[in-house]
């Protein structure tokens, strides 16, 4: 940390005679510079030079060859590297007065006569005298205005809107300034800044529009930072809205956007009269062309039980906005003919959610469902197969005689989804078939009995059992079962010999 530079003469203020010369020396541990009252155009008679000495310190000398009233003011010596735009200059100061009997007040630029006051805040009317001893009064249309005066700054106080004149008398001669105009501007201690980007996603060739609005403040400086700033791509506009309250709307427009215009768009607002700063940022993405992404929350094979409720939710990211439709087996889904509803909802700027709701699943709802999302640049789809699971049921159980051979075939037709398994059981003691323990599962490897299964279609199966010879009455049970349930039916097989006896009787 460097100690502050020092100034010779080592005084807070100094009165210098008109037209005389004066010099100020600054000593520092690093390179030092001077800040002084006049602008560079006016400072032809101010010379600044570096001086060598053997103290090891850096020395910069400011020399004025002929002092005038305009040289009255604050001279500051500071370290070069410590100066930032943000902060007040840190350094060592000396105030120089150059009294001039013909110039009572230090000359000012035209903008200094405009005094901006924030709501009921104190302000300075900057009429500074060239001589610290000169008495000064402040006047407005109503007369003398009581306010505290400092010859280095001017009058400090709370002033109402309107013109003010400073008056001084030097050696019996009266001097008046031109009027200082006090303007009241709306300015709050906090900046109320809002950023709005109606869109944050664009494609090449579109126009990016971002706005920043400042509320209840007229004293604002707003700067934009954005990817195309270096190329000066953006067009900025300011609209002032006064009703119902003050609102400054700054708009940045970037026409003919390209992918390179993707990035952060930032507006930084600063209050002109206070060190209040507020920033807002939005990220804009520009795509070469439109896009669509489909993200289902379920798999490509889905099962639903008969009569169940089921939701299928699909998330879609797309730009430009997509048209979303549902198909069933490649045909447009006609909702009013089914117990199915669909809807599409915009969740965020480029995010959509579509739901297909099965209100009461039926067998005929099985099939391939496709969601199609399309815009002018892309088409995407997602297809899934829906299987309505139906408990197994037996449609038919019949027997078939093989004439004189005494063989018999029993056919059992069952349906269900998934396709039912068919099991056969037999009960050889017909009188005891009411007792479950009398039934035995028919094994496939029994020599004189053949079992076979044929699928008729996706949901119907036929099982056959062939008995080479039935010598006594037996009962046969067909058991059809799948994940959702089981059903069985029984049939009595009578031996051919017994049957012929029955027929004769």
């Amino acid at each position: 940390q460097l100690s502050l530079p020092s100034i010779l003469p080592n005084e807070n203020e100094k009165v210098v005679q008109l037209n005389s010369s004066f010099s100020l020396r600054c000593f520092g541990e690093s390179e030092v510079s001077w800040q002084y009252p006049m602008s560079e155009e006016e400072s032809s008679d101010v010379e600044i030079r570096n001086e060598e000495n053997n103290s090891g310190l850096f020395v910069t000398v400011l020399e004025v060859s002929s002092a005038s009233a305009a040289h009255t003011g604050l001279y500051t010596c500071y370290y070069n590297h410590t100066q930032t735009e943000e902060n007040e200059l840190e350094g060592r100061h000396i105030y120089i007065y150059v009294p001039d009997p013909d110039v009572a007040f230090v000359p000012l630029g035209m903008t200094d006569y405009l005094v901006i006051v924030e709501d009921d805040d104190s302000a300075i009317i900057p009429c500074r005298t060239t001589d610290p001893e000169t008495p000064v009064t402040l006047h407005n249309s109503e007369g003398v205005v009581p306010a505290s005066y400092d010859s280095r700054q001017g009058f400090n106080g709370t002033f109402t809107v309107g013109p003010y004149i400073c008056e001084a008398t030097v050696k019996g001669k009266k001097f008046q300034t031109i009027p200082f105009n006090v303007y009241a501007l709306k300015a709050t201690s906090e900046l109320d800044l809002e950023m709005e980007a109606l869109k944050t996603v664009y494609k090449s060739g579109e126009t990016i529009v971002v706005t920043c609005a400042v509320f209840n403040n007229e004293v604002v400086d707003l700067q934009w930072t954005y990817p195309g700033e270096v190329k000066g791509k953006g067009i900025t506009m300011l609209e002032e809205i006064k009703v119902p309250s003050i609102k400054l709307v700054y708009t940045l427009t970037v026409p003919e956007a390209t992918v390179k215009d993707s990035g952060d768009y930032e507006c930084a607002a600063r209050q002109a009269t206070r060190e209040v700063k507020e920033m807002k940022k939005v990220t804009i993405s520009v795509h070469e062309k439109g896009f669509i992404e489909i993200k289902p929350t379920f798999s490509q094979l889905e099962a639903v039980n008969l009569h169940e409720v089921k939701h299928f939710v699909v998330e879609v990211r797309a730009y430009p906005p997509p048209r979303i439709s549902w198909l069933k087996n490649n045909l447009t889904l006609i909702e009013n003919l089914t117990e199915i509803t669909t809807d599409v909802e915009k969740i965020q700027e480029i995010r959509y959610r579509s739901k297909l709701k099965l209100i009461r699943a039926k067998e005929e709802d099985s099939g391939h469902y496709t969601i199609v999302a399309q815009n002018e640049d892309a088409v995407k789809s997602y297809t899934f197969e829906l299987l309505t699971q139906v408990p197994s049921s037996i449609l038919d159980l019949v027997d078939d005689h093989h004439g004189s051979t005494g063989g018999q075939t029993v056919r059992c037709t069952a349906e269900g989804t998934p396709l039912p398994d068919i099991e056969w059981m037999i009960c050889k003691d017909i009188k005891k078939c009411n007792n479950e323990t009398s039934w035995t599962i028919l094994a496939n490897n029994v020599s004189n009995i053949i079992t076979e299964i044929h699928s008729r279609d996706r949901s119907t199966v036929e099982g056959r059992v062939t008995f080479a010879k039935v010598e006594e009455t037996i009962a046969v049970r067909c058991l059809a079962k799948n994940l959702l349930g089981a059903e069985n039916r029984e049939l009595k097989l009578v031996a051919p010999t017994l049957r012929s006896e029955l027929t004769v009787a």
Epitope: N305, E308, V309, H311, V313, T341, D343, E345
Partner: antibody
């Protein structure tokens, strides 16, 4: 936070209609179905139907078919349930409930609206 | 319609007791079942969804189990604020149906 605020108690004569409102806040109204459930004093709960606020699709329980109408006004995020041809046995507290689509189960309920049907 | 049979219809218990409430569905409903708590004059509050998932913010003393046709709500250690009516709801098929409710009272 998610809130469902229902309209105040109603007293109706038999044969009249009642319209109960359910104002939703704290979430995207159109993203979740609204169901209506009623509960007669000291009794269990009875489901009346559902409505999708985005599409306007509805589904009603068989016993209310023809008497109940569920609608919505998305601009004010409000769902409505109108029950017509009121009878004394319709005296109950009527609840709206938000159906979470991921679990398809009610996760938030309104505070209830007492409807009294009396001559 | 699916019938939901809830038992018991009421029970008396003391603070600290373990309480079990059962719901049976007249047909399989997978895990499409939720449990709710209701206090007098108040709207129901969801405790359990998908048969066994605990709603966030609900104390861990509440748990749910079961699938298909038999479901259970268990309160491991009854607290004073748990005295209320509990009911189940199946959302497997329309119409949605509720259990008759179980009133948990102080012994």
């Amino acid at each position: 936070q998610v809130q469902l605020v229902q309209s105040g108690a109603e007293v109706k004569k038999p044969g009249a209609s009642v319209k109960v409102s359910c104002k939703a806040s704290g979430y995207t109204f159109t993203s979740y179905d609204i169901n209506w459930v009623r509960q007669a004093t000291g009794q269990g709960l009875e489901w009346m139907g559902w409505m999708n606020p985005n599409s306007g699709n509805t589904g009603y329980a068989q016993q209310f078919q023809g008497r109940v109408t569920m609608t919505r006004n998305t601009s004010i995020t409000t769902a409505y349930m109108e029950l017509s041809s009121l009878r004394s046995e319709d005296t109950a507290v009527y609840y709206c409930a938000r159906e979470e689509y991921s679990s398809s189960l009610f996760d938030s309920w309104g505070q209830g609206t007492l409807v009294t049907v009396s001559s | 319609d699916i019938q939901m049979t809830q038992s018991p219809s009421s029970l008396s218990a003391s603070v600290g007791d373990r309480v079990t409430i059962t719901c049976r569905a007249s047909q399989g409903i997978r895990n499409n079942l939720g449990w709710f708590q209701q206090k007098p004059g108040k709207a129901p509050k969801r405790l359990i969804y998908a048969a066994s998932s605990l709603q966030s913010g609900v104390p861990s003393r509440f748990s749910g189990s079961g699938s298909g046709t038999k479901f259970t709500l268990t309160i491991s250690s009854l607290q004073p604020e748990d005295f209320a009516t509990y009911f189940c709801l199946q959302h497997n098929r329309y119409p949605l149906t509720f259990g008759g409710g179980t009133k948990v009272e102080i012994k």
